[in-house]
């Protein structure tokens, strides 16, 4: 099964995907596609990187993080209900069957007119971490788990990276204090 990520119509959606480059600047090709990861490729590609740069992207899809450090998380701008569905992040590590592939489910909810949800409720969903395990085919694809051990430095960093998300706005506007421990 895949982990579910949520956004509201009109917001930016964030789908996390990371890898650790063997050395700084030693990048591997990555592709993002709409639809579950097929056996070799990425489905209907919306964004692709090569060993140097983003070499293909479509409107509204971009990488907000530092992809040169392995943060290839996808941001989808101004989402609509039609953006709901499964997305594939495929890290095309050279070698024999080294690909890492992740299926992420994006659920788009109609825009709320009620107050924003509390920080407590959205915390885990907004700060996921990759559990990177390898699979050799779609049936063995592993996906993502929730974050068990965030610290304040990570919160600060992630909040900056997710500045368009509701949680980042909550952190900024509410002055919330988060206790770890």
């Amino acid at each position: 099964s895949e982990v579910e990520y949520r956004a509201e119509v009109g917001q930016n959606a964030y789908l996390p995907c990371f890898y650790t480059p063997a050395a700084p600047g030693n990048l591997v090709p990555v592709c993002w596609g709409k639809g579950a990861c097929p056996v070799f490729e990425c489905g209907n590609v919306v964004l692709r990187t090569d060993e140097r740069d983003v070499n293909y992207w479509t409107s509204r899809y971009w990488l907000n993080g530092d992809f040169r450090k392995g943060d290839v998380s996808l941001t989808i701008e101004n989402v609509t209900l039609a953006d709901s569905g499964i997305y594939c992040c495929r890290i095309q590590i050279p070698g024999i069957m080294n690909d890492e592939k992740f299926n992420l489910k994006l659920v788009i909810k109609p825009a709320k007119v009620t107050p924003a949800p509390t920080l407590q409720r959205d915390f885990t969903a907004a700060f996921p971490r990759m559990l990177t395990t390898r699979g050799h085919g779609p049936a063995e694809t592993q996906t993502l788990g929730s974050l068990p051990d965030i610290n304040l430095t990570q919160i600060s960093t992630l909040a900056n990276e997710l500045r368009d998300s509701r949680l980042a706005n909550d952190l900024r506007d509410s002055g919330a204090t988060i206790r770890i421990g």
Partner: antibody, heavy 119, light 111 residues
């Protein structure tokens, strides 16, 4: 028009090596996974190697460690290097294009090149 | 590995008749609601030709008399009214897992 043209087949002794080439034209080669599929005389089809658009490699156990696949996007070409050849590797070898966005099935095939492993 | 078993090995049919070919996978090839199963046609001395992908989608340029159905482990290729050019060998193939595997083929011959 999409075209795939294989070359490099021939007669080789057991234990020998051979390098097959597949020249592609009529499509944006770098966007597609490419595979090699073989067919022994009078037998069925067997997939033997694939390389994704990003350069990841895939093989069945029957050829792993003996065969390798590579691609040169600048030359629109795909290659199958076959080492430690055995009599059971005798077959027509087809180069096949994986369907865009998937790669796991084949919408265009070359006409094949015959590899005969015999002493 | 996923083993693909086709039946019958040979099918004798008269022109104009309906042909039904079967393929069974050793495990499910369903993936997020799609059956990762293909059918190919091969004539003597020629390369295979893709007919059906994802169990039931007819490849562009393939006559409408060809259709595919099935899900899970059991799949069928149907040729509604056999034409002379349809006598060939037909292979199923799964794209669920590496290694990609083909069935042993069904030869459709003239009765």
């Amino acid at each position: 028009e999409v075209q795939l043209v294989e070359s490099g087949g021939g007669l080789v002794q057991p234990g020998g090596s051979l390098r097959l080439s597949c020249a592609a034209s009529g499509f944006t080669f770098s966007r597609y996974a490419m595979s090699w599929v073989r067919q022994a005389p009078g037998k069925g089809l067997e997939w033997v190697a694939a390389i994704s658009s990003g350069g990841s490699l895939y093989f069945p156990d029957s050829v792993k460690g003996r065969f390798t696949i590579s691609r040169d996007n600048a030359k629109n070409s795909c290659y199958l290097q076959m080492n430690s050849l055995r009599a059971e590797d005798t077959a027509v070898y087809y180069c096949a294009r994986g369907r865009e966005a998937d790669g796991g099935y084949f919408d265009y095939w070359g006409q094949g090149t015959l590899v005969t492993v015999s002493s | 590995d996923i083993v693909m078993t086709q039946s019958p090995a040979t099918l004798s049919v008269s022109p104009g008749e309906r042909a039904t070919l079967s393929c069974r996978a050793s495990e499910s090839v369903e993936y997020y609601g799609t059956s990762l199963m293909q059918w190919y046609q091969q004539k003597p001395g020629q390369a295979p030709r893709l007919l059906i992908y994802a169990a039931s989608n007819v490849e562009s340029g393939v006559p409408a008399r060809f259709s595919g159905s099935g899900s899970g482990t059991d799949f069928t290729l149907t040729i509604s009214s056999l034409q002379s050019e349809d006598f060939a060998v037909y292979y199923c193939q799964q794209s669920m897992k590496v290694p990609l595997t083909f069935g042993g083929g069904t030869k459709v011959e003239i009765k």
